[in-house]
Amino acid sequence: MMTGTIETTGNISAEKGGSIILQCHLSSTTAQVTQVNWEQQDQLLAICNADLGWHISPSFKDRVAPGPGLGLTLQSLTVNDTGEYFCIYHTYPDGTYTGRIFLEVLESSVAEHGARFQIPHHHHHH
């Protein structure tokens, strides 16, 4: 049975030209994290594999930095970066947990971080 939950930074906003950290945390499970995928809608941004290290998609390599931890740092933000981001945790023996973050990139300087909050986990058990 999958008992884990994914905690994310939730809904966040940032200024155009700035940077933002996308962060998820898996809790309430002793499952081993083997890989974390970061996706924007259906587009792969990066993979962090426990044994192989990071793969940053070539399309994003100039403005995506690995970390901190299993998180991802997006740099040189544009309005086009607004949208949904997903952290997909592959774990053993539980299977897959998915967290969602919504990022809004703002033109003005009124960008504020949303409060950190917990979302229900979605999973595909393999």
Partner: antibody, heavy 119, light 107 residues
Framework: EVQLVQSGAEVKKPGASVKVSCKAS????????MHWVRQAPGQRLEWMGR????????KYNEKFKSRVTITVDKLSSTAYMELSSLRSEDTAVYYC????????????WGQGTTVTVSS | DIVMTQSPDSLAVSLGERATINCRVS??????LAWYQQKPGQSPKLLVY???TLAEGVPDRFSGSGSGTDFTLTISSLQAEDVAVYYC?????????FGPGTKVDIK
């Protein structure tokens, strides 16, 4: 057009070292990780390690960790694989291979470099 | 290490007929499996990644399927130029490992 051009065949004595080069062209060298894979005669392919040409960070197959070093020269868009303490079982074709867009597989391969270890 | 096995070791198929190659993996790798084609004296060529995504420029007679521990590469209508050895490879952990290969010939 993506091209990976490797250095020529080498014959080495047991205990020696070999350094194989792989010159990349047709794409932004620092945007794609590079892998090294070898194939001994009649054997399956065997992964040796990978490197991020941008940062120089590398990961190795534990089997080769003490003997292999993968490096890059960003200025010349060239990756290198050095294998030390050679033995006869290291006789193989050595390939460099570019990592794909969506993960740790390889989408383009060099032509291969034959390394023969013989006394 | 993740162990990859392939079946059959070799197969001979008539031109225009279907060829099916299986790859079994010792543990769950989700869909992180690639297939390569290697012709004699040549480098491997990527056919499929993520179990079912066809690489750029690969004819659509090739297709991949499966997830978890069991995967299949299918050539729907074998052509003369498809004579080669086919390897599966997981792209999920260290070390990346390959299957022993399946040799495909014309009957």
């Amino acid at each position: 057009e993506v091209q990976l051009v490797q250095s020529g065949a080498e014959v080495k004595k047991p205990g020696a070292s070999v350094k194989v080069s792989c010159k990349a062209s047709g794409y932004t060298f620092t945007n794609y990780y590079m892998h090294w894979v070898r194939q001994a005669p009649g054997q399956r392919l065997e992964w040796m390690g990978r490197i991020d040409p941008d940062s120089g960070g590398s990961k190795y197959n534990e089997k080769f960790k003490s003997r292999v070093t993968i490096t890059v020269d960003k200025l010349s868009s060239t990756a290198y694989m050095e294998l030390s303490s050679l033995r006869s079982e290291d006789t193989a074709v050595y390939y460099c291979a570019r990592e794909g867009h969506y993960g740790f597989y390889s989408d383009y391969w060099g032509q291969g470099t034959t390394v023969t270890v013989s006394s | 290490d993740i162990v990859m096995t392939q079946s059959p070791d070799s197969l001979a198929v008539s031109l225009g007929e279907r060829a099916t190659i299986n790859c079994r993996v010792s543990e769950n790798i989700y869909s992180y499996l690639a297939w390569y084609q290697q012709k004699p004296g040549q480098s491997p060529k990527l056919l499929v990644y993520n179990a079912k995504t066809l690489a750029e420029g690969v004819p659509d007679r090739f297709s991949g399927s499966g997830s978890g521990t069991d995967f299949t590469l299918t050539i729907s209508s074998l052509q003369a130029e498809d004579v080669a050895v086919y390897y599966c490879q997981h792209h999920y952990g260290n070390p990346l490992t390959f299957g022993p290969g399946t040799k495909v010939d014309i009957k």
